[in-house]
């Protein structure tokens, strides 16, 4: 049971880490015009990895998007490459997962299969997890180093009276999206691989011990260490992890062919 | 199309508060766009007051310090400026405006004059 | 505050004539994020409200005749008209758009020969 809850909660957790993953990704704000002395202000910057955008007090918001690749910062093109790998391993590490959890039947999927399966999907939600936290770090990086340099030469003089504001960028909501996105991703990987431990079938086989008494043949099997850990075939434990351990949402989110209840 | 209109006391007294009207129609001031309040002295100079935000929220021009204030009223598409301790110095037309692209105004008002005498 | 000087504080011109008036602004009105200059010209007749004619420096409203034309970057900006025809005399203003508080120069008076 703790490790059918362990493997569901790793799945769960890593589910919405790497949805938060992808939303940071998409996300405009990975840097915010800082708006160190002037809270309101007029025209308002940010940007993301894929475009910059600008808002008006007047209510409009242009979004330009970044079309050269050859021109962009090498900075930015591995924060984008670190973001989407994150994504591509924990897609495919949901993909493993799905198959691997001890609620879902297959076929006759042997349970060493589906406990090799569940370390893989970890591996991958922990490496999906670093890819992100990774990305995210670099570009929080960046920012810093931009901002300490811009703020060095914050007014740059033209000419006496007339003065250039130069843009200074802070960390944007993405920022802390990632963060704790990658974060989740990577609990949900170590629960994963936590519950592969658990998964993964006794060595010791418990052979079948016959007890001959005076005038009777009676055979006695212990299935009961079996039954009571969850790994038999007990019907009874079986219905207790299909059916009562589950809310409405994830019936719905697996195919009803996959489900012997 | 959207339409603006100013209205207040022709004349204030010196030390006494300015409360200006602007009723807008065509538009819902909670709908989106800031809402502005600008006015023009007698030699023609302009300048900048204040805005009601479509959220509620308002910004003022730093020079009036805590002597100016923005509100509005939703149900009646009306928002409103008080300039408290007028003075000879703020006998001007305001008008209120709705910002457009660039933070410029497209949208104004017709203007009310307000003469500060004794 | 940005400081909006506006020159000349008035002209004298004949009808066709081509007529060049400056703004100048005490800080860059340009916004690196969208490569966008934030200055504003807007026109005023007597007992009218200001009417808006250019933003971003250059992009005319709808409706303004095509003889308006604004141009220039960062500090220094220009308003054209390449044939002025009597109902263009009037008073021409500029505006910072770039930060609060928003402010206004002190204007162009266009006046006939």
């Known amino acids: 049971m703790a490790v059918t809850a362990c493997q569901g909660l790793g799945f769960v957790v890593s589910l919405i880490g790497i949805a938060g993953i992808i939303a940071a990704t998409c996300m405009d704000q990975w840097s915010t015009q800082d708006l160190y002395n002037n809270p309101v202000t007029a025209v308002f910057n940010y940007q993301g990895l894929w475009r910059s955008c600008v808002r008006e007090s007047s209510g409009f918001t242009e979004c330009r998007g970044y079309f050269t690749l050859l021109g962009l910062p090498a900075m930015l093109q591995a924060v984008r490459a670190l973001m989407i790998v994150g994504i591509v391993l924990g897609a495919i590490g949901l993909l493993v997962s799905i198959f691997a959890l001890k609620c879902i039947r297959i076929g006759s999927m042997e349970d060493s299969a589906k406990a090799n399966m569940t370390l893989t999907s970890g591996i991958m939600f922990i490496v999906s997890g670093l890819c992100a936290i990774a990305g995210v770090s670099v570009f929080a990086n960046m920012l810093v180093t931009n901002f300490w340099m811009s703020t060095a030469n914050m007014y740059t003089g033209m000419g006496g009276m007339v003065q250039t504001v130069q843009t200074r960028y802070t960390f944007g909501a993405a920022l802390f999206v990632g963060w704790v996105a990658g974060g989740l991703t990577l609990i949900g990987g170590v629960m994963m691989c936590i519950a592969c431990r658990g998964l993964a079938p006794e060595e010791t086989n418990y052979k079948a011990v016959s007890y001959h008494a005076s005038g009777h043949s009676v055979a006695y099997k212990p299935g009961g260490f079996k039954a009571s850990t969850g790994f038999g075939s007990n019907t009874k434990n079986k219905k207790i992890y299909d059916g009562g351990a589950r809310t409405e949402d994830e019936v719905q989110s697996y195919p009803s062919k996959h489900d012997y209840v | 199309d959207v339409q603006l209109q100013e209205s207040g006391p022709d004349l204030v007294k010196p030390s006494q508060s300015l409360s200006l009207t602007c009723t807008v129609s065509?538009?819902?001031?909670?709908?989106?766009?800031?809402w502005h309040w600008i006015r023009q002295f007698p030699g023609n100079k302009l300048e900048w007051l204040a805005y009601?935000?479509?959220?509620?929220?308002?910004n003022y021009n730093p020079s009036f310090k805590s002597r100016i204030s923005i509100s509005r009223d939703t149900s009646k598409n009306q928002f409103f400026l008080q300039l408290k301790s007028v003075t000879t110095e703020d006998t001007a037309t305001y008008y209120c405006?709705?910002?457009?692209?660039?933070?410029?105004?497209?949208?104004w008002g017709q203007g009310t004059l307000v003469t500060v005498s004794a | 505050d940005i400081v909006m000087t506006q020159s000349p504080s008035s002209l004298t011109v004949t009808a066709g004539e081509k007529v060049t008036m400056n703004c100048k602004s005490s800080?860059?009105?340009?916004?690196?994020?969208?490569?966008?200059?934030?200055l504003t010209w807007y026109q005023q007749k007597p007992g009218q409200p200001p009417r808006l004619l250019i933003y971003?420096?250059?992009t005319r409203e709808s409706g303004v005749p095509d003889r308006f034309t604004g141009s220039g970057s960062g500090t220094d900006f220009t308003l054209t008209i390449s044939s002025v025809q009597a109902e263009d005399l009037s008073l021409y203003y500029c505006?910072?758009?770039?930060?609060?508080?928003?402010?206004f120069g002190a204007g162009t008076k266009l006046e006939l020969k």
């Open positions: 009601m935000q479509y959220s509620g929220s308002s």
């Open positions: 405006a709705r910002m457009y692209n660039g933070n410029s105004f497209l949208y």
């Open positions: 065509g538009y819902s001031i909670s709908g989106a766009y800031n």
């Open positions: 800080q860059s009105l340009f916004n690196s994020g969208n490569q966008k200059n934030y």
């Open positions: 505006q910072n758009s770039y930060s609060y508080p928003l402010t």
């Open positions: 971003w420096a250059s």
